[in-house]
């Protein structure tokens, strides 16, 4: 007979049970796979020299045997010879020292019996009372079972633990949790009430936290102020330093860490809600406000330590978006309306002195006027932006004030207070002779070129005494020099400079006369 | 002549049904263990089913559990193969096959007879 087949002869041995105490017993056997079958047993006694039969008899009465030599456990086909569709009746026989004992004979449908399953599926994992909980769908048909568990941690090997008898369509098991390192568990199941019986293969890992989670290790990246006055926050996570065990590596669930973003919008501190708290997958939308981010993390047990950083305002400025008319009876500052219905935060301080509060006012819903403008007035009285200096102004518009990640930025500018006229007038204006015909023109720069985007040129103003003929020449805002060609000599000049605004224009300086000398030739 | 011939195949969607008859002639078959098996392309033949003598005891492949169904009619000299729930991966050419000796193996080759086969095409 080969030995991958059920032989259909007498056994080599003299088939009488010696009835002793020891022998073969929980003979169990199962289908493994769709053609595959195992059957495996105990031995009591001493193993040496001890051969032995896996018995098995057929519906028809015909009888057969494996021989396994020293081993107690077996496999074999469904190509072996023996009836896997109809019931058989199997034993085992087994032979030292002159001497047969036979185990109880367990009589079954082989292709009906299938081996106990691990926990399948999901295995659900919760807290309690410092200890680990978890709980699973019984297989089916498979109601009643011993369970066992293993876990190891990224430095140790598999420990083993005992979850009980388990007696209900699911099961569940108390396992120890560690504080501070991620565990991998595996859990195996055996039918209840047949010690003999095999074990289930291992589930797949279950991979657990610490108790604690980790402090999350993010960067972050802020995109460009897009057109709607928006730039996306985009958080590059990092891989947690969290070291894992060898069957927890890759992308296993369970382990993971959670993140969710608490946005806090510093800029502009009279609207209704600053705060806001989001989920990390869920990338917001900034204004180009200033912000706090704190990325707190959390696992499946619970919320961890926090990360907080700062995200500067953007400091892009729309130079010409903002108008503003300075009146007698106040200031009205105009800009590009929005949508119906949305509320505006105007938000002013003066530069150099970003580290103080900025002052904040925030409009009523408005619509737009006919002109498809926004407005916002303030009297002379109230002070605001009175002062002859420097101030930025941030505009900030939502049509759900409440929310916190739809505010965008309408604008941002610059605005020299006070008498802007008056206050930038250029001084220290000098001439010098250049050539022939020509003269240099140079002055001390304006007091609105401190803020950025406000003036908008220098006019250089030369009237010829003579003739009272007036030439006017802009000068880019950023020189404080020009020159003035085709002169005549002997014609007394007087020239001015002013410094103009997109919506102002300037004081003239004080006149500076000024003649070229008449060459005499030899 | 002893004869197996399946019917009853076809294009089928994915969840329909479709039903397979064996019809056995040339000598009585109500005696054998019956059974269905199925072959894809460039796969062995697979177990799909089996049902013996007196319909006492079924056996399914764990891949048509609860969506199959193995039945007899001696009196007509017929098996049938319920299928329910189809899908894709189901579609193959289904075979009939006997085992006159009891043999009660899910190997096709302790079969003795066998029919033609019947294509069945599962759509998505």
């Known amino acids: 007979c080969r030995t991958s087949e059920c032989c259909f002869q007498d056994p080599p041995y003299s088939d009488a049970d010696s009835g002793s105490a020891s022998g073969p017993r929980d003979l169990s056997c199962y289908r493994i796979s769709s053609a595959g079958y195992e059957c495996s047993w105990q031995y009591e006694g001493p193993t040496a020299g001890v051969s032995h039969f896996l018995r098995c008899c057929l519906s028809s009465g015909r009888c057969c045997y494996f021989a396994t030599g020293s081993a107690t456990r077996l496999q074999f086909s469904d190509q072996a010879g023996v009836s896997v569709l109809h019931t058989v009746t199997l034993w085992v026989e087994s032979w030292a020292r002159n001497r047969t004992e036979k185990s109880p004979e367990v009589t079954l449908q082989l292709y009906k019996s299938v081996k106990y399953k691990p926990p399948l599926g999901d295995i659900k994992v919760s807290k309690l009372a410092g200890q680990l909980r978890m709980e699973w769908e019984t297989p089916d048909n498979q109601v009643g079972a011993e369970v066992q568990f293993r876990h190891r941690t990224p430095s140790s090997s598999w420990k083993l633990g005992d979850c009980g008898p388990q007696d209900d369509d699911t099961e569940s098991c108390l396992c120890p949790l560690e504080m501070n390192v991620a565990q991998e568990f595996q859990l195996r199941r055996r039918r209840l009430g047949s010690q003999g019986s095999s074990w289930s293969k291992w589930s797949s890992p279950v991979c657990v936290p610490p108790e604690n989670p980790p402090q999350p290790q993010v960067r972050f990246s802020v995109e460009q102020l897009g057109r709607d006055g928006r730039r996306r926050l985009t958080l590059k996570e990092q891989p947690t330093q969290l070291e894992l065990p060898e069957g927890c590596q890759g992308p296993a669930p369970g382990v993971e860490v959670t993140y969710q973003l608490q946005l806090h919008m510093l800029s502009c501190p009279c609207k209704a809600k600053a705060t806001r708290t989001l989920p990390l997958e869920k990338m917001p939308y900034l204004s180009g406000a200033a912000y706090n981010v704190a990325v707190i993390s959390s696992n499946r047990f619970g919320p961890g330590p926090n990360q907080t950083w700062h995200i500067p305002a953007d400091t892009h400025t729309e130079p010409v978006a903002l108008n503003i008319s300075v009146g007698t009876n106040g200031t009205t500052m105009y800009w590009p309306a929005r949508a119906q219905s949305t509320t505006y935060c105007i938000e002013w301080q003066p530069v150099g002195q970003e580290g103080s509060l900025a002052t904040c006012n925030l409009t009523a819903p408005q619509d737009p006027d006919p002109a498809g403008m926004a407005t916002y007035s303030w009297s002379r009285e109230s002070g605001a932006m009175g002062q002859e200096k420097c101030y930025h102004i941030t505009i900030f518009a939502s049509a759900h004030p409440k929310k916190l990640t739809l505010w965008s930025t309408v604008l941002s500018t610059y605005h020299f207070g006070g008498n802007a006229s008056a206050a930038g007038t250029p001084h220290h204006v000098s001439v010098k002779n250049h050539s022939l015909d020509s003269v240099s023109v140079d002055w001390a720069p304006s007091l609105l070129s401190t803020c950025p985007g406000v003036l908008k040129e220098y006019v250089v103003r030369c009237r010829d005494e003579d003739s009272n003929q007036v030439s006017e020449h802009p000068v880019q805002p950023t020189e404080t020099q020009v020159t003035l060609s085709d002169l005549r000599a002997g014609v007394a000049y007087t020239v001015q400079v002013r410094a103009d605004t997109a919506w102002l224009r300037g004081a003239w300086s004080q006149p500076q006369r000024f003649s070229i000398k008449v060459q005499v030739s030899d | 002549q002893v004869q197996l011939v399946e019917s009853g195949g076809g294009l089928a969607q994915a969840g329909g049904s479709l039903r397979l008859s064996c019809a056995a002639s040339?000598?009585?078959?109500?005696?054998?263990?019956m059974a269905w098996f199925r072959q894809a392309p460039g796969k062995e033949r697979e177990f799909v089913a089996h049902i013996d003598r007196n319909a006492a005891s079924t056996n399914y492949a764990d891949s048509v559990k609860g969506r199959f169904t193995i039945s007899r009619d001696n009196a007509k000299n017929t098996v049938y193969l319920q299928m329910t729930r189809l899908k894709p991966e189901d579609t193959a050419v289904y075979y009939c096959?006997?085992?006159?000796?009891?043999?009660?193996?899910?190997?096709?080759?302790?079969?003795?007879?066998w029919g033609p086969g019947t294509q069945v095409t599962v759509s998505s």
């Open positions: 040339g000598r009585t078959f109500s005696n054998d263990d």
């Open positions: 096959a006997a085992d006159p000796d009891h043999f009660g193996t899910t190997w096709y080759q302790q079969y003795t007879y």
